[in-house]
Structure formats: C-alpha cells, structure tokens
C-alpha cells in the first residue's frame, strides 16, 4: 500500500547523515520503473533540504540533526511517477514527529524577582510568584517540567526557613512566624528551577522579599502642649503645627499621621490636615473666630495613622490653647440685603427707609453712611442716621435702571476705627406701580383703501401694571369721528379703526384718545395714508398711465 505511518525522529541526532528513516514503496513498481520524490516544508520549500528521498529506492533520508524547539513536526508529501513522468499514485502524506531531548535548561523570566509581605503575618500568607520557562516538552515528557525550590535565604534570622515555595507554581509563601521589619527589613532568597520535575538541569535566580511595616507603633506628640495666637475672622489661617514621632517605616501608611480634633471645637471653627512631607498636623481656621464671642479656645487633638493599628496601642493626645486676638471689624448692614416697597414717583425729599449697620466691635464706634451705587441718581443717604430719601423721580417703567420692578442700590458704612473699615449693603427698592402712563396704540401709521376698506387693528399697550391697564376705551376727537370709527375689542386690548366715508387719496391725521381701567387718558395721532384702491393695501399704487 502507498501509505507511511507517522515517523518519530529524536532531535539532536548524531547521524551519520544522510540517515535512512523509512522507505516509500508503491506496488506499481511491479509493472513499471518508479521514481520517488518528496515535497513540502523541509524538502523543497524552506527549510529546504532537511529531508530528501532516494529517487529510485524510495528511502526517506534525514540530512542533518533536527531541533524540536524550532520545528516539532514536518508534513511532507511523497510522489511516485513512472519513467515518462506520469503520476502513478496520489500524493502521500508523510508526518515526521520530532521527539524531545532535554537539551534546554529552565530559564527564570527575571534575574531578580521582587515581592513584599507585611511583617508579623500568619504563616501561609502568599508573598509572590516566580516563573521559569523551559523550551523542552512538558506534555509527553518531564524534560520541560519545572520544579521550584528555595536554595538559600539571607539573612537566616530568626530562622533559616522563613519562606517556602510551591513546587509547581512557584508561589512563595511565609512558612514561619517572626517576620519583623524592625529587625530584618528584607530577605534575599536564592531560588532554583530544576527540569525533569526536579531531577534534571537547574538554574537559579534571586527573589527579594521586602518586609512591609505593620502599624505596631503609635505616633506620639512631641511636645504634647501648645499655645497659639490667631487674629479674629481669619479663615484658613495656620494656627499651629503639631509634631509627632512614629517608629514605623517613614512615609508608609503605618507612619503617616491622621489627626482628629477630639474636643474644644464646638463651633466647628478649626480643621487639621497632615503635611505630606513632615507628617506634622497643620491646625488651621475653618471659620473666622470671634474675639467678642470667645477669646480663647482649648482644643484636644488625637493622632492615629492612615493604617489601622495591628494591636491595641494607646493613642497620643495634644492640648492646644488658642488665644483669639481682637481686630477692627467692618460694620455689617442688617440685613445685608434689604427689600423696601416704595411707590414710584414719590415727591423729592420723601423718606424711603432707614438702612443701618452694626459694628461687631465692642467699642462704641461711630458709623457713617453713604451711597456707593445709585445708577439713576434717585436717592440720597444721611451720613449719620442712614435715612434714605428720594432726590429724583423713581420711575418703575424706566427700563434702563429698573429690572422686574426692582431698583438696586449699594450703600456703604464706615467706622471710625484705626484703620477704618467699611461694609456694604444692598438696598432693593420694589417700586409699586402708579397709573402714570396712558394707553398707546401700535402701529401709529396705517395705509387703507378708500373703496371697500379693510378694518385696521391696532394693539394697545400700557407701561403700567394691572389694574392700571386693560380694559381700554377708545374715542375719536377733533372731528376724526366724521370719517372714522374706533372700537375696542371684547378683550379690551386692541382698537379697530375703520374708514366709514370716502376720502380721496391723501394722508390724514386721526385723533385717537385711549383711556385705561384707571381712566388715564392718552391722545395719539394716527397717520392714515388713504389710497385709491379696493380692499387691502400696504402701499398706495402709483398713478395709472394710459397707453
């Protein structure tokens, strides 16, 4: 039969080469002379020439040693042809399996592995994993099966076997009690990887195990008592730096201090943060202190670490006496923003309100007042009493200065301290509407045909507020009612102007008197352009020219 079983060839064969492997034979050779050839990677394609075939005998030849780690299997095709070159058999698959030799040592993936573990952990705790690879086969043989071991440990304190390693996975674990960072901060392990599952070639690497600090020392205040002076009202002011000492590893969570105000800060006036480098507690003011309310604060501050203590440790407490220093404080308007209702258009000299400030200082300081910002110049303020009066006409409808019926004024109070301090207040005048505007029609110019004219609808606007607005009433004056009619609609917010008699093309004044709900009357002249046309028109047509 024209078949060949898979051929196994050990790698690294010593020859001699060419080495006969197997004979290809076609039973057609009884009828005709057969010539044999092989194709495929390893024969006629890269890597060429590894295998050959004796053309006339069919012997498959190996020309050089094989390397399983380079190519583990070759797939070739055998061919049989007659003397005239005609194929006498289908191409035959030839599988050549390269069997492994233990020709590679294990290799650690790193020369030095680094891991860490907390001091004082329970035996059994995992530290790190080391890895070695072996290019040899680990599936069908033990050539590439690596076993790990610890060859030595430095230092050998408190025992020479502080760690163990998982034979197969390379996981290093703590095996003994007594890891103490303060005594041994780092261990150097010489680790071995041995192939043949521990019975073959060995390679070594180093595993450095850093012993991390556990929080077994409490931070201690040094000193424990402090006195500080702080000006009143200062926010974010550094009051005091508190110093602690901690025997744990510097800059570790077991060393870094966490400060807590335990008592004496009833008003939540203080905050304490940790300086990232010095580890000091920086006590600052969160809110301004008030000398007049309390001129001395006694704070109690406790210190712990970022990391929890691993055993019961006494916490250290510091006492800080904070003396508050008096400063000249600015007068404060009461309230800071005052809303006052006042009628628009009140007479000049009429009082609007009294707006005064209080001085937080206990000394009887004199306060003087003045207006800081009065955009329309409508007001004046008495410097001694804080009395605000009208000096101009307050106009609610003045869109330049009044927003949503409110006129905003800023006032200033100044004490006579040395140096003097000032405080500001905001006066919000809510202007009460007065019926001081009559209704106005829009538009005030109309164009209308003198034949079958269309009614002109004019909108009525009134700057005042209800009830000083609609419903409106309309009346034509100065004989305008001879040619025109004016009627207010049912809603009372538009007026309809109609041409009731023929007028020749020209421009006319229509005298329209509108009055609001409060009978405030406003006379408006409507400019009406009458055109020679029918129905609706926007501009008068030009004169007709005959041809």
């Amino acid at each position: 039969d024209w078949v060949v079983a898979p051929i196994s060839v050990p790698e690294n064969g010593k020859g001699p080469f060419p080495q006969r492997l197997n004979q290809l034979k076609s039973n057609k050779d009884r009828d005709t002379k057969i010539f044999y050839s092989i194709t495929g990677p390893g024969a006629d394609s890269p890597p060429e020439g590894v295998f050959a075939v004796e053309k006339e005998t069919g012997w498959l030849l190996l020309n050089k040693p094989l390397d399983r780690e380079e190519i583990a299997k070759y797939e070739l095709f055998g061919h049989a042809v007659s003397e005239n070159g005609a194929s006498v058999e289908d191409p035959m698959n030839i599988s050549i399996i390269v069997t492994d030799q233990n020709d590679h040592k294990p290799k650690f993936t790193q020369d030095t592995f680094r891991g860490s573990v907390l001091e004082g952990v329970l035996p059994g705790t995992s530290v790190m994993q080391v890895t070695a690879t072996d290019e040899d086969d680990a599936i069908y043989t033990y050539n590439g099966v690596v076993a790990y071991s610890i060859h030595s440990q430095e230092p050998k304190d408190p025992h020479d076997l502080m760690f163990t390693i998982h034979r197969s996975t390379g996981t290093i674990s703590v095996i003994s009690s007594g890891l103490d960072r303060e005594k041994v901060p780092e261990y150097t392990l010489t680790i071995q990887a041995t192939d043949m599952d521990g019975d073959g070639s060995t390679t070594t690497a180093v595993a450095v195990v850093e012993i991390l600090d556990a929080n077994d020392n409490a931070p201690m205040f040094d000193p424990q008592k402090y006195e500080a002076h702080v000006p009143e009202n200062a926010v974010g002011h550094e009051v005091q730096r508190l110093t602690v000492t901690d025997l744990d590893a510097p800059n570790s969570p077991a060393w870094r201090a966490t400060y807590l105000i335990m008592g004496g800060d009833d008003g939540d006036h203080f905050t304490i943060t940790t300086h990232p480098e010095s580890n000091q507690g920086i006590l600052t003011t969160r809110k301004g202190l008030d000398f007049e309310a309390k001129n001395q604060h006694t704070l109690y501050v406790e210190v712990t670490n970022e990391a929890p203590f691993v055993l019961k440790l006494p916490t250290s407490t510091a006492t800080i006496v904070v003396h508050v220093e008096d400063v000249n404080e600015a007068p404060v308007f009461v309230p800071p923003s005052k809303v006052v209702e006042v009628q628009e258009g009140i007479p000049t000299g009429e009082p609007v309100c009294v707006y005064t400030a209080e001085d937080p200082d206990k000394e009887n300081q004199k306060i003087s007042y003045r207006i800081l910002r009065d955009p329309a110049g409508w007001l004046a303020m008495d410097p001694d009493s804080g009395q605000v009066t009208a000096v101009g006409t307050l106009d609610r409808e003045d869109e330049q200065f009044v927003r949503n019926n409110i006129y905003e004024v800023m006032v200033l109070a100044m004490d006579n301290g040395s140096p003097p301090t000032t405080g500001t207040g905001t006066l919000l005048l809510t202007l009460i509407d007065v019926n001081d505007h009559g209704p106005v029609p829009e538009p005030r110019q109309i164009t209308i045909c003198n034949q079958s004219p269309v009614r002109q609808v004019l909108n009525i606007t009134d700057k005042d507020l209800s009830p000083h607005t609609s419903p409106f009433q309309a009346q034509l004056t100065d004989d305008s009612d001879i040619y025109w009619t004016a009627e207010v609609n049912e809603e009372g917010d538009t007026v309809v102007l109609s041409l009731k008699k023929f007028l020749k093309q020209d421009t006319y004044d229509v005298h329209l008197s509108l009055s609001d709900h409060g009978n405030k009357e406003q006379l408006t002249v409507i400019r009406a352009t009458v055109c020679d046309c029918h129905g609706h028109v926007e501009t008068c047509p030009g004169p007709w020219k005959g041809g």
Partner: antibody
C-alpha cells in the same frame, strides 16, 4: 518548659456564648502565631482559627466565620477564643497550639465545650 | 470528608513494622515538604512526632520515620510496641486557606 493551658470550656445552650483562654509559658509568646484546633467526639482534627504574633492577622474556618473571634494579649501571654451563637455541631474538645507554619507544636491539654439544650 | 486521605485503621504485632499513608494533591502534599504527623492517645492532646516529612522533634523515638513520593506521604513505625497504639493524624501545609489540612486519622492497633 514550654506549656499551653486551656480553660473556659463547659456546657452551654444553643445560641449561647463561651470564652476560651489559653495561658502560655516557657517561650516568647509574642513571636509565634497561635491557633485553635478542635476535635468533635470520635472525629478527626479541624483547624478552627489562627492569629499572628502581633495579633494583626487572623484566620477563621468557614464553619465558624462571623461567630468566633480569636484574640491575644501578649502582655499576659494569653490566647482567647470568643465563641458566640454556639451550635450543637460546635461540641468538641478545643486545643490551642502554636502554629509554626508547617506544623502545630506544642499543644495544650484541651478544654471540652458541650452545646446542648 | 477530610482534605487528606488516610486509612481508617492499621494493625501490627509487637516488633513488626507498619506504614500509614496520607494522600493529598499537587497543591499540598505534592507541592511542599511540610507534611507533619501527630500521635494522639485516647483522652490526650495530639503530639507532634514528625515535621517536614521526616524530621523528628527531640524526645521522639527513631522508630518513627517519614517519607514522601509525589502526592503521598507515609509514616513508618518499626519495632511496634504496645505504647504505639494510638490515633495518627497527618497534616500538610498548603498555600491556600486553610493553610493546614488534616487527614481523617488512622487508628493503629498493636495486636
């Protein structure tokens, strides 16, 4: 002489509590991890809990997690096991032992805990 | 169901030798040389007789020896004596919690 001496066992109703103590002598107690191992009547050994030398690291078997608390007072050379919400299946002799990592040695003489109504 | 498998009982006559096996996995017995053996007489506390597969603590008779092959450890007692009659427990370190596994125990009877 290295010695471990347990106490605190007794009869308790289901749902009740007990506190076991183990007094150590003859070795530097704070340098060694300690553990509690129990043995139900006629049964094998079961590791219950362990604590590191400083007390900062603890281990509990799933069967007691959330109910038992291991602690130690190195100033008194004493190991404790606080047992709450006790069940009938917690009935056993409780031994304290030094956990060296690869083995348990020495062992105390044991204290009997019986959970029964 | 114990994590490590031991025969429930073995027996032997005085002067004979016996072996107790302890089978685990490649993650415990097979992975570490930290197999220990404990002897427990009725009503008494366990006592360490072998650590690290075959190391005897001081005071333990050299008739006790240990070995390990693959995932199975063995305790051998030569020259059996009446006082050897007891329960024997194996234990192995493992890198996963719980870090110590116990066998179910083997009752040794000296005939």
């Amino acid at each position: 002489e290295v010695q471990l001496l347990e106490s605190g066992g007794g009869l308790v109703q289901p749902g009740g509590s007990l506190r076991l103590s183990c007094a150590a002598s003859g070795f530097t107690f704070s340098s060694y991890a300690m553990s509690w191992v129990r043995q139900a009547p006629g049964k094998g050994l079961e590791w219950v809990s362990a604590i590191s030398g400083s007390g900062g690291s603890t281990y509990y078997a799933d069967s007691v997690k959330g109910r038992f608390t291991i602690s130690r007072d190195n100033s008194k050379n004493t190991l404790y096991l606080q047992m709450n919400s006790l069940r009938a299946e917690d009935t056993a002799v409780y031994y304290c032992a030094s956990w060296g990592g690869g083995w348990f040695d020495p062992w105390g003489q044991g204290t009997m805990v019986t959970v029964s109504s | 169901q114990s994590a490590l498998t031991q025969p429930a009982s073995v027996s032997g006559s005085p002067g004979q030798s016996i072996t107790i096996s302890c089978t685990g996995t490649s993650n415990d017995v097979g992975a570490y040389n930290y197999v220990s053996w404990y002897q427990q007489h009725p009503g008494k506390a366990p006592k360490l007789i072998l650590s690290e597969v075959n190391k005897r603590p001081s005071g333990v008779s050299n008739r006790f020896s240990g070995s390990k092959s693959g995932n199975t450890a063995s305790l051998s007692i030569s020259g059996l004596q009446a006082e050897d009659e007891a329960d024997y427990y194996c234990s192995s370190f493992t890198s996963q919690i719980p870090w110590a596994l116990f066998g179910g125990g083997t009752k040794l009877t000296v005939l």
